[in-house]
Structures are given as structure tokens and as C-alpha cells.
């Protein structure tokens, strides 16, 4: 239940602190990589990396065709890695074609970076299992 | 010293509209990506909307996707919210804030009320 | 959306003493917690990010700890000017961000 907090609408202008800020003066936020594309086939493994580096430490979240990623599990699932995150989908469908993009955060910046996956049907491709061809 | 003055409040009809804009000064606005946080009278909180540095990148709480609008002009170190369909559940104190979800900067906020 | 639920809804102690203010989240949000203080007519003002970094300009007194799912903002020894609404507020799952309802800490 939502508790009522009586906080009085009459503004006062004191609220900008006049203070430099640590947490401004050492904040950083990049993009290490732009995300990986890539062409599969029905059956394979994809994985497409978010490389982000960053201080407050980033959070990342995954979205497809701009919805948020729900994993599933021993077939869909993203992970946090030394580099950022990485969205790891086994068993690829057709259906998992789409706009794939990251959205990381430091608290004070956003970058983001979108790749494509595309699942076409017919045979892998012969060079290994999980090939990945990047454009 | 880092300051942020919102302006544009007021009351306006159900199914109305009313642009908010918070002039930006003490910090390099292009550097920081910008945020607007509501509050009901006597309610908490409510992230609505933050827009990147850049302007690029705009995210949105979903009661408000397809009716409220972020934007800045860095050129002005000014950020807007342009709120179109505007309900009665949209009245609340307006803050912008510097930053997407760490708030250590904020303005003195500015009263929205939709009312017939 | 991942939900903060804040205990005690209201707090009544005297200055002096020392407050325990809890929020728990409905998911982990991992040390991505802060808490902020609320004055009746005036901005929210940081004072913990990340679960337990104090913000800048923020006296000693003030503390957080927690990761996971469960987090304590501590006043080691309340001062008059303590007196406040205070939430918590998480980024993991941004966006969105989301806030606690909020606890009120008055005075006894």
C-alpha cells in the first residue's frame, strides 16, 4: 500500500547545492566497441557483446526491436563480463532476427549501441559450429 | 557552483499541453545527461524521462511514452519536457536533475496541475 | 519493474539517537541503491550512492550498507536538521530507475 508523505508544494531555492562534485569530477563513461552484427542460421549460437567501460561502475540492460530482453532460461540469457555485458541466445530461431541494443548508464551518462541479428534458414555455415559472420 | 532553474508550471486543462525547461549553469551541460523526476502533492518520487548528453538517446517511464517529449538544446544549456494529453495523474512538482540515475544535482522544481 | 519497499513508514526518535532506515528490493538490484533526504519545499538531496558511497558534502554521520536485495541507511547520531522524509532509490534495471515510497523520520 502507498504510504502518503505530506511534502509541501511551496518551493524553496535551495536546492543546488553549492558543493563541486567528486562524484561529476570523476565520472567517465565510454563505449569501448561498437556492438558486433551478425548472420547465423536456425539451430546456432549467437552472442553479442556490450563493451562499456565506466566509473560510477555502468549498468547495462538489453533490449530487442526496443523491448526489454526477458531471458529464458538454457536459452536465452545476458551476463555481466569484465568487458561490459554479454547476450548470449542458443538454438536461434528465425524469430530472434532483429535490432538487438545496449543501454548502459554510469548514473550521470547514457551510451548505447545497437547491432542486427539476422537467422536465415538453411544449412550453417561449414566453416565451424557457432560461426558468426560479422558486417 | 552548479545550477539548475526549471520554469513553465502552471495549470492547465485535462487533454492539454504545457513545455517545461530547465536552464542549466556551473557545469558542462554536453557532458551529462539530463533527467526529469515528478512528485504528486504528498506522494513520493517518479522518474519520468532522461535524455543523453547528446541528445541521441531519450527514455521514458511508460505512463508517459507517446504524450511527454525530453529534448535540450546544448547550444542554450537548456532541457525541455514538452507534455502533450496532459491527465490529472500528471500533477506534480517537476524537478530536472543532472544525470540518468545518480541525482546529486537538482533544480527547485516547478508545479504542473491538470485540472477541469 | 523492480519494486523498493521502504520500513518503517514513519520514524519517531530524538535527537541524539541513532536511526536505522531499511529498503528492500523486489529483485536484486545489486549495490546500485541510493538514498536521498527530502526538507518540506525543497529538492531531493543525495546522500548515498551505490549502496554505501557517500555523496559530496555529506557529514560522516550519515551511512549505507546492503547489496542484494537488502539495504540500511544509518544516522549514527540524529542532529535537528536530520529531521526529513528519506528514499531509496535503485539503477540497476535502468531505465527505468525507481524510488522507494519513502520514510518519514520525526521528531519524538
Known amino acids: 500500500q502507498e504510504t502518503e508523505l505530506s511534502v509541501s508544494a511551496e518551493l524553496v531555492p535551495t536546492s543546488s547545492w553549492n558543493i563541486s562534485s567528486e562524484l561529476n569530477k570523476d565520472s567517465y563513461l565510454t563505449l569501448d566497441e561498437p556492438m558486433n552484427n551478425i548472420t547465423t542460421s536456425l539451430g546456432q549460437t549467437a552472442e553479442l557483446h556490450c563493451k562499456v567501460s565506466g566509473n560510477p561502475p555502468p549498468t547495462i540492460r538489453w533490449f530487442k526491436n526496443d523491448a526489454p530482453v526477458v531471458q529464458e532460461p538454457r536459452r536465452l540469457s545476458f551476463r555481466s563480463t569484465i568487458y561490459g555485458s554479454r547476450l548470449r541466445i542458443r538454438n536461434l530461431d528465425t524469430t530472434d532476427t532483429g535490432y538487438f541494443q545496449c543501454v548502459a548508464t554510469n548514473g550521470k551518462e547514457v551510451v548505447s549501441s545497437t547491432g542486427v541479428l539476422f537467422v536465415k534458414f538453411g544449412p550453417p555455415p561449414t566453416a565451424s559450429p557457432g560461426y558468426s559472420d560479422e558486417y | 557552483e552548479v545550477q539548475l532553474l526549471e520554469s513553465g508550471g502552471g495549470l492547465v486543462q485535462p487533454g492539454g499541453s504545457l513545455r517545461l525547461s530547465c536552464a542549466a549553469s556551473g557545469f558542462t551541460f554536453t557532458s551529462y545527461a539530463m533527467s526529469w523526476v515528478r512528485q504528486a502533492p504528498g506522494k513520493g518520487l517518479e522518474w519520468v524521462s532522461t535524455i543523453s548528453g547528446s541528445g541521441g538517446g531519450t527514455y521514458y517511464t511508460d505512463s508517459v511514452k507517446g504524450r511527454f517529449t525530453i529534448s535540450r538544446d546544448n547550444s542554450k544549456n537548456t532541457l525541455y519536457l514538452q507534455m502533450n494529453s496532459l491527465r490529472a495523474e500528471d500533477t506534480a512538482v517537476y524537478y530536472c536533475?543532472?544525470?540518468?540515475?545518480?541525482?546529486?544535482?537538482w533544480g527547485q522544481g516547478t508545479l504542473v496541475t491538470v485540472s477541469s | 519493474e523492480i519494486v523498493l519497499t521502504q520500513s518503517p513508514a514513519t520514524l519517531s526518535l530524538s535527537p541524539g539517537e541513532r536511526a536505522t532506515l531499511s529498503c528492500r528490493a523486489s529483485?536484486?538490484?545489486?549495490?546500485?541503491l541510493a538514498w536521498y533526504q527530502q526538507k518540506p519545499g525543497q529538492a531531493p538531496r543525495l546522500l548515498i550512492y551505490d549502496a554505501s558511497n557517500r555523496a559530496t558534502g555529506i557529514p560522516a554521520r550519515f551511512s549505507g550498507s546492503g547489496s542484494g536485495t537488502d539495504f540500511t541507511l544509518t544516522i549514527s547520531s540524529l542532529e535537528p536538521e536530520d529531521f526529513a522524509v528519506y528514499y531509496c532509490q535503485q539503477r540497476s534495471n535502468w531505465p527505468p530507475c525507481t524510488f522507494g515510497q519513502g520514510t518519514r523520520l520525526e521528531i519524538k
Open positions: 529483485q536484486s538490484v545489486s549495490s546500485y
Open positions: 536533475a543532472q544525470g540518468s540515475s545518480i541525482f546529486d544535482y
